[in-house]
Interface confidence: medium
């Protein structure tokens, strides 16, 4: 019969014959022959292959370098790579999460609209009229000005986006 020019799924063509690919988690040791099956071996510890393959070497698991602010989110297996994420207070610089940067703080006059996650930075928003933030923080939202009226006081000093109002006693009318 004619030698094949294409092979079925999970097979590969070598020396004019179709050999089985190695399953995920295993690497190729020797190609099949007319008389023998493809020989595969499991990947070693800290190695993986995530596809049906004919690789002679497994890939090393990703190292989550704590010096780059990384930690293991999901431990790798023989079929999957390790997934890294950032330490609390940091977020990934890319989708691959190869390194982390510090979450930004929101300056006075700005509050946290959305707290940062392992993959996204802090989102700040300017404090609208009636709200303020007097600190630089990665956690603090804009907070409403104190209501002097509810304390039976009057506004002595108007609030800003960075300062609360200052309340004081009402002036008593003299007879």
């Amino acid at each position: 019969p004619e030698p094949p020019t294409a092979c079925r799924e999970k097979q590969y063509l070598i020396n004019s014959q179709c050999c089985s690919l190695c399953q995920p988690g295993q690497k190729l040791v020797s190609d099949c022959t007319e008389f023998t099956e493809t020989e595969c071996l499991p990947c070693g510890e800290s190695e993986f292959l995530d596809t049906w393959n004919r690789e002679t070497h497994c890939h090393q698991h990703k190292y989550c370098d704590p010096n780059l602010g990384l930690r293991v989110q999901q431990k790798g297996t023989s079929e999957t790579d390790t997934i890294c994420t950032c330490e609390e207070g940091w977020h990934c610089t890319s989708e691959a999460c190869e390194s982390c940067v510090l979450h930004r703080s929101c300056s006075p006059g700005f509050g946290v609209k959305q707290i940062a996650t392992g993959v996204s930075d802090t989102i700040c928003e300017p404090c609208p009229v009636g709200f303020f933030s007097n600190v630089s923080s990665a956690f603090e939202k804009c907070h409403p000005w104190t209501s002097c009226e509810t304390k039976d006081l009057v506004v002595q000093q108007a609030g800003t986006n960075k300062t609360d109002v200052v309340c004081g006693p009402q002036d008593r009318l003299r007879a």
Epitope: G89, L102, V112, N134, F139, K141, H143
Partner: nanobody
């Protein structure tokens, strides 16, 4: 010199309570984000809770939400962690930390206080 000194750890039965304190000095405490982190025996660091400078905004790890409460007294330069309904898996050394303002993970750490939950 910046110093963070934790206290209040100890041995407690499951379901019990403890209150940790962290006395801070050497920096402007009332302007700093603060947090508690912990390290269980043989495990890595785990973030527990964070609090904003004014103490108005607090955040918790899912594992402690509803059981732990972070608070602060800026007039006393002290950070607190009230721990209720303690479980065996809460056993760890607890550290208070000043949140980072540089590429360091945390600017400063305390020496930690050991919490052991066991019957």
């Amino acid at each position: 010199e910046v110093q963070l000194l934790e206290s209040g750890g100890g041995l407690v039965q499951p379901g019990g309570s403890l209150r940790l304190s962290c006395a801070a000095s050497g920096f402007t405490f009332g302007e700093s984000d603060m947090k508690w982190v912990r390290q269980a025996p043989g495990k890595g660091l785990e973030w527990v809770s964070s609090i904003s400078p004014n103490g108005w905004d607090t955040y918790y790890a899912d594992s402690v939400k509803g059981r732990f409460t972070i608070s602060r007294d800026n007039s006393k330069n002290t950070l607190y962690l009230q721990m209720n309904s303690l479980r065996a898996e809460d056993t760890a050394v607890y550290y208070c930390a000043k949140s980072p303002s540089s590429r360091l993970k945390f600017d400063y750490w305390g020496q930690g206080t050991l919490v052991t939950v066991s019957s």
